[in-house]
């Protein structure tokens, strides 16, 4: 999908998620997001980022890992892992601040 606001050069990224409109997308950067919802297997989604680059800097937790990169199809072969499960008293939050 075209991104309307004026910004720097766009990059083409692999798009693999239930919401992709095709095999690639164009954005300000490429993303890989690995998410494990309660009681489900982790799911890895690939796509494009245009907002909230700060999520790229968040540390992995046992529930989510964000990865970002800035070159053509750079997210294609990236595989992420989650942090090992910790005792409840030590669970990290998802707030990246």
């Amino acid at each position: 999908d075209p991104v309307k606001p004026s910004r720097g050069p766009l990059v083409t990224c692999t798009c693999e998620s239930p919401h992709c409109k095709g095999p690639t997308c164009r954005g300000a950067w490429c993303t890989v997001v690995l998410v494990r919802e309660e009681g489900r297997h982790p799911q890895e989604h690939r796509g494009c980022g245009n907002l909230h680059r700060e999520l790229c800097r968040g540390r992995p937790t046992e529930f989510v890992n964000h990865y970002c990169c800035d070159s053509h199809l750079c997210n294609h072969n990236v595989s992420l892992v989650l942090e090992a499960t910790q005792p409840p008293s030590e669970q990290p939050g998802t707030d990246g601040q």
Epitope: K4, P5, S6, H19, T31, L51, H52, V64, D95, G96
Partner: antibody, heavy 118, light 108 residues
Framework: QVQLQESGPGLVKPSQTLSLTCTVS??????????WNWIRQHPGKGLEWIGY???????YYNPSLKSRVTISVATSKNQFSLKLSSVTAADTAVYYC??????????WGQGTLVTVSS | EIVLTQSPGTLSLSPGERATLSCRAS???????LAWYQQKPGQAPRLLIY???SRATGIPDRFSGSGSGTDFTLTISRLEPEDFALYYC?????????FGQGTRLEIK
Amino acid sequence: QVQLQESGPGLVKPSQTLSLTCTVSGGSISSGDYYWNWIRQHPGKGLEWIGYIYYSGSTYYNPSLKSRVTISVATSKNQFSLKLSSVTAADTAVYYCAREATEGFDYWGQGTLVTVSS
Amino acid sequence: EIVLTQSPGTLSLSPGERATLSCRASQSVSTTYLAWYQQKPGQAPRLLIYGASSRATGIPDRFSGSGSGTDFTLTISRLEPEDFALYYCQHYGTSSITFGQGTRLEIK
């Protein structure tokens, strides 16, 4: 047509926790293109951003509220929620949920007034 | 944290006139993430302009946005009666989302 609807108690006692839920219809909260925000507006005042959550569960909060705020997401219900602890009268406000896209905050709930009073 | 300062606080004009609303950022911001909203009493804000200059869907062309760096402007070329409302600028898309304090546009 995307719609957002806030729900929760309109009256909360001081020192208690304010809890609100935003239900999204006409679109999926799991889309990677959007971020889901809470904003509030004190009576007769301007807009104050509270925080956002991504479908992955990652959050960012307004530093001035961070110690009291928790935002969570329930993708299976297409909902996200706000909890604000240790409330005082200063937390009396209209609370809005909104969708953030590349094009800005393009869809908003109608807002719900929460009054903090004993 | 980026602070957005709007001016004037209140603007009194007549229908048919041109309105110019200012938003100044405490440091340079990307035009990509600068938006303007309109709010009427008892209603949620409505997105007018995003990316500093792009009109949101369904917004009349009498509304336009411009600016870059630290200075941004919302212009309403010919005021209609329904345009008298509160207007907010916003910096979004980053870890610290902020709104200006608002400009009230009232009928003179």
